[in-house]
């Protein structure tokens, strides 16, 4: 039903005037307001501007705005005691070493506090040896090295370019390979987009640029110290020898002019294939050791991080719905950023701040949501979600009971080609139906609307007509509330063309060149991409927040289903003889997907005719919607990774950015072959069957009717 | 306007010490490597020594190592060559240059030159 049906609401104030008041303008100056200095999670900076973020939200007229506060495991440099790598010659002397820092933008030579380039949580330590190159590390790298060439890790330091996976992905294979540390660095393949000029003359990382960020295993943990509970004033702390993810081996981020130092004296074997060499004028060698004529020369790393329990804020913002205050739709991203954040995260924290700006305006002219919509600016993001996490573990009985969508609103943009959405499922139609209402902000699409250029530049692989929906899987905020707590979540942001640029993320991600200069010059001078991402998650939020009826359809979930439970057959049929010598059947995940199809039809065809002024009817039917992505949470979590329990989707066990279906049967039927008791392997392949038939079919009884 | 000053040349004994300086203006010195060149007279160029913009490379030519020592004060915007030890054959032009490529981790090729300060060992 359309959102002017909801209730204290008058023509005026619809779906309409909300976006209207959304303007370009401002976002553009909240951009500028936000990423002048750093905003380093844990200083004094970030909690100036959450105090800023409260005052203001206040000022545009929530009912409340509170700061939450926990005190969590961070890390930093040792000021005095900067980390680099060296090569040193046979007499122990350096005779190399990288950067300690990046060249400063144009204009920010003098700003103070800029984080030097580290890997956050990194231990310290100083190791010593001789080199391999790993390509992306990822775990089909380590089997190329490992079992075709034969080489092994054990006791040597790794260079991996950063890119394909998640980065703490890459430190948790080397840690497993042997290795004794880990270089990281930013090869012009993944980072340097051909035809574009380097920083500041262009987006693309100049070769003194590097990527920060933390390479922590947490698993949704949330502050490594307190897992499952949130880090409060009477919080019981793990001793760091038990803390969650954290990595146990020495590592470092490095620019591609540093990377060619340690690179071009490579030798041992030439790269299996081209797949592995980068853009770099060096071999790509594999290792391990210097060629001859340095073979006598080492690495040797020198990181002096130290952690520390340092106290984060969130700001909380409220607005109560008139009519079901118990409903929670919320919107929430982060504020923390690396150095200045220009895109990630204050693209999207500029947004969030004109969307409650305009919910706002809106509030002052009379009008209230149907529900109520709370407003997240997490800190501590980009040291492993732990605002997010910590708040939604302090308020889990609350979320679980009421929480009905949660959107995430980190970057706005990571290209300006189209729109990228992740969500689940039961979000797919409101988000087709609200792109069909915005207009496009494409050149060549004036008059059409986002829906038609977005299907245009990212068409569907499976449905003809219709755009391209990703899996939600990790590496933000939406982790606790969609893969702990089962809330419906999503997520939406312009991007750049994945056909055509085949470099990783946006060239100058999490480096000191994330700068309001480089949104404003190079990638939305107007701002009319970061407006229309305005629109959709305001539009996603409002028509939760406001339609009369939840706008979840439960069908869709139905049709991915069953594409999941075909996609893991095929995967499983891979070893025929197997399934056949340890009777393993998807009999019951197919019967449960059907159960779950033929239960979501009855249910939508309910939907359609129930008495909607039958307040009774109507919050029983919607709590039956609401608590549709609850019913795919198992208690007792996923094997090893208690906090990511959604039995449909988790985070990739190889790639925490990427979002895997049925991650039970697919974790235990990955490399099976390799398993030492194939008996033993394959009895948890047919339990984790049982697990995702009993949890769909658990699911469609959730839409049945109820007596 | 990009330009390099140098400063403190002059006439100084075998064995003695100087310290060169170089007043950088029009760009920021935190960004480039910068090297000191020499030309003794009637020679042609001579790389002395060269420091990364971020400090954590000094590269010196064989013939001034362990004698030599440049560096560099952001806040300031100014390079240094503290010279000791000096000899006879240190006589020569000295110039400061800036590299070419913001965040070069060795010497490249030199861009901005200054116009020179005269050193000049002699008892």
């Known amino acids: 039903k359309s959102s002017n049906e909801a209730t204290n609401i008058t023509p005026k104030h619809n779906m309409k005037a909300f976006l209207d008041e959304l303007k370009a303008e401002n976002i553009k100056k909240f951009l500028y307001n936000f990423t002048q200095i750093p905003h380093l999670a844990g200083t004094e900076q970030n909690f100036q501007l959450a105090k800023q973020i409260q005052s203001q939200w206040k000022e545009f007229g929530l009912d409340s705005v509170e700061l939450a506060h926990y005190d969590v495991l961070l890390s930093y440099p040792n000021k005095t005691h900067p980390n680099y790598i060296s090569i040193i010659n046979e007499d122990g002397n350096e005779i190399f070493n990288t950067s300690l820092f990046e060249p400063p933008p144009p204009g920010y030579e003098n700003v103070s506090d800029i984080v030097p380039p580290f890997s956050a949580f990194s231990p310290q330590g100083m190791p010593e040896g001789d080199l391999v190159y790993v390509n992306y590390a990822r775990t089909e790298d380590f089997f190329k090295l490992e079992r075709d060439m034969k080489i092994n890790c054990s006791g040597k330091i790794v260079i991996a370019r950063y890119g394909k996976v998640f980065r703490g992905n890459k430190v948790k294979n080397a840690q497993l390979a042997g290795a004794k540390g880990v270089i990281l660095y930013s090869d012009p393949a993944d980072y340097f987009a051909p035809g574009v000029k380097s920083y500041p003359d262009g987006w693309n990382l100049p070769g003194g640029g590097v990527q920060r960020g933390n390479i922590l295993n947490l698993n949704g943990a949330g502050d490594p110290l307190t897992p499952g509970y949130p880090a409060n004033e009477y919080a019981y702390r793990r001793g760091i020898a038990e803390a969650v993810g954290l990595p146990s081996i020495p590592v470092h981020p490095i620019g591609y002019y540093d990377a060619q130092k340690l690179l071009e004296k490579m030798g041992g074997s030439a790269p299996p294939d081209s797949s592995w060499r980068g853009s770099l004028k060096v071999p790509y060698n594999v290792g391990p050791g210097f060629t001859g004529n340095f073979s006598t020369q080492k690495v040797k790393m020198h990181i002096h991080s130290t952690n520390e329990v340092t106290r984060i804020y969130n700001v909380i913002g409220t607005l109560r719905g008139a009519v079901e205050p118990d409903r929670y739709v919320i919107l929430g991203g982060h504020r923390d950023s690396w150095v200045f954040g220009g895109i990630d995260p204050q693209s999207g924290a500029a947004v969030v701040h004109e969307i409650v700006r305009s919910f706002g305006t809106l509030k002052k002219e009379g009008w209230r949501p149907r529900r109520t919509i709370l407003f997240a600016s997490w800190d501590a993001e980009e040291f492993g979600l732990l605002g997010s996490t910590e708040w939604a573990e302090e308020n889990s009985r609350l979320l679980q009971e009421r929480g009905v969508a949660y959107i995430n609103a980190d970057s706005s943009i990571e290209g300006n080609y189209t729109l990228r959405v992740d969500c689940t499922p039961l979000m797919y139609s409101l988000v087709h139906n609200l792109t069909k209402e915005l207009k496009s902000p494409d050149e060549g699409f004036e008059g059409k609307s986002l829906y038609e250029s977005w299907t245009k530049k990212s068409p569907s692989p499976e449905f003809s007509g219709m755009p391209r929906i990703s899996k939600l899987g990790s590496g933000n905020d939406f982790e606790v509330f969609f893969q702990r707590l089962g809330i419906a979540s999503g997520r939406a942001r312009y991007t750049k063309n994945w056909e055509t640029n085949k470099f990783s993320g946006y060239p100058l991600y999490h480096s000191v060149y994330e700068t309001y200069e480089l949104v404003e010059k190079f990638y939305d001078p107007m701002f009319k991409y970061h407006l229309t991402v305005a629109q959709v998650r305001g539009g996603m939020v409002f028509e939760l927040a406001n339609s009369i009826v939840l706008p979840f359809d439960c069908r869709d979930y139905a049709v991915v289903l069953r594409k999941y439970a075909d996609k893991i057959y095929s995967i499983s049929m891979k070893h025929p003889q197997e399934m056949k010598t340890y009777s393993v059947s998807f009999d019951s995940l197919f019967s449960a997907v059907k159960n779950f199809t033929e239960i979501a039809s009855k249910f939508s065809e309910r939907l359609q005719d129930f008495d909607k002024s039958n307040p009774i009817v109507l919050r029983m039917m919607n709590d039956q919607l609401m608590f549709l992505e609850r019913a795919f949470i198992d208690p007792l979590g996923l094997p090893d990774r208690p906090f990511y329990r959604h039995v449909i989707y988790a985070p990739s066990s190889h790639n925490k950015y990427a979002g895997e279906s049925f991650p039970g049967i697919y974790d235990a039927l990955f490399d099976i072959e390799s398993k030492v008791d194939p008996s033993k392997a394959w009895g948890e392949v047919k339990r984790q069957i049982y697990v995702a038939a009993f949890t769909v079919q658990a699911a469609a009884e959730t839409l049945s009717e109820v007596a | 306007e990009v330009q390099l000053v140098e400063s403190g040349g002059g006439v100084v004994q075998p064995g003695r010490s100087l310290r060169l300086s170089c007043a950088a203006s029009?760009?920021?010195?935190?960004?480039?490597?910068m090297n000191w060149v020499r030309q003794a007279p009637g020679k042609g160029l001579d790389w002395v020594a060269f420091?990364?913009?971020?400090?954590?490379?000094?590269y010196y030519a064989d013939s001034v190592k362990g004698r030599f020592t440049i560096s560099k004060d952001n806040s300031k915007n100014t390079l240094y060559l503290q010279m000791n030890s000096l000899r006879a054959e240190d006589t020569a032009v000295y110039y400061c240059?800036?590299?070419?490529?913001?965040?070069?981790?060795?010497?490249?090729?030199?861009?901005?030159w200054g116009q020179g300060t005269m050193v000049t060992v002699s008892s």
């Open positions: 240059a800036k590299d070419r490529i913001v965040g070069a981790r060795v010497p490249d090729a030199f861009d901005i």
């Open positions: 029009g760009f920021p010195l935190i960004s480039y490597g």
């Open positions: 420091i990364s913009y971020d400090g954590s490379n000094k």
